[in-house]
């Protein structure tokens, strides 16, 4: 669970998220699982004054 | 909406196990991440641990080998235990649930906890 | 682990005023690009509310007069303007390393 070494990148930088696809990041304990596995944020209702979050945990490309 | 309704005792004595149940509705405990965190009597809050949806833990070293969090799918429930309390378990008893980012966004009312002879 | 020190511990201010703490960690909490830094309102009898995650978004329902600041390990939470219901305590948390931890609180009262 989020052990060894890892390198602090800059606020825009992308996350490293080497998932195979319908797999996400799982931030918490560093490892790549089954998107449903994990529970996001709670959406933005309609015309929220904070923008929608810049996720770190979609399926790779 | 995901709800969270902690159970158990209100008075253990010391030396004794205590054993806490977070019933969980709204979301299964097959996904995400359900921690307990206590509050003490000034203000202090201390995250205890979680399990997650694959049923790992981590527990805060601060409880060393005292704690355990389990869960039951089929109930939907986890729990707690602690074993060997004493005064300094006194506290309020939360379970929580977090998003993605480990905010916990989800909390039940509370069980509050005192530790006496 | 990380200790998170808030300041002030407690802070008094006027009804639509600007109130501003702050939480300041032993070492960053940032990775990924991103600050695992969160902000908590918790009044007497009922559990923490999530008001602000990641530093500075804004948790669904939160009215847009609490905002969160910072990166690294200097953080800050803003309530502009401050309501009557604002009074409680204020925690900021951590969940970049193991154990997660909470600062110490803020006590936020009306003048």
């Known amino acids: 669970m989020r052990r060894g070494p890892r390198s602090l990148r800059g606020r825009d930088a992308p996350a490293p998220t080497p998932c195979v696809p319908a797999e996400c990041f799982d931030l918490l304990v560093r490892a790549c699982v089954a998107c449903g596995l994990l529970r996001t944020p709670r959406p933005k209702p309609a015309g929220a004054s904070s923008p929608a979050p810049r996720t770190a945990l979609q399926p790779q490309e | 909406e995901v709800q969270l309704q902690e159970s158990g005792p209100s008075l253990v004595k010391p030396s004794q196990t205590l054993s806490l149940t977070c019933s969980v509705t709204?979301?299964?405990?097959?996904?995400?991440?359900w921690n307990w965190i206590r509050k003490f009597p000034g203000n202090k809050l201390e995250f205890m641990g979680y399990i997650n949806y694959s049923g790992t833990t981590y527990y805060n070293p601060s409880l060393k080998s005292r704690i355990s969090i389990t869960r039951d799918t089929s109930k939907n429930q986890y729990y707690l235990q602690l074993n060997s309390v004493t005064t300094e378990d006194t506290a309020t008893y939360y379970c929580?649930?977090?998003?993605?980012?480990?905010?916990?966004?989800?909390w039940g009312q509370g069980t509050t906890l005192t530790v006496s002879a | 682990d990380i200790v998170l020190t808030q300041s002030p511990v407690s802070l008094a201010v006027s009804l639509g005023q600007r109130a501003t703490i702050s939480c300041r960690a032993s070492?960053?909490?940032?990775?990924?690009?991103?600050?695992?830094m969160h902000w908590y309102q918790q009044k007497p009898g009922q559990p923490p509310k999530l008001l602000i995650y990641?530093?500075?978004d804004l948790e669904s329902g939160i009215p847009a007069r609490f905002s969160g600041s910072g990166s690294g390990t200097d953080f800050t939470l803003t309530i502009n303007p401050v309501e009557t219901d604002d009074v409680a305590i204020y925690y900021c948390?951590?969940?970049?390393?193991?154990?997660?931890?909470f600062g110490g609180g803020t006590k936020l009262e009306i003048k």
């Open positions: 070492e960053s909490v940032d990775d990924y690009g991103i600050s695992f």
């Open positions: 990641r530093a500075s």
């Open positions: 929580a649930t977090p998003h993605t980012y480990g905010a916990m966004d989800y």
């Open positions: 948390q951590q969940t970049s390393k193991d154990p997660w931890t």
């Open positions: 709204g979301d299964s405990i097959t996904r995400g991440y």
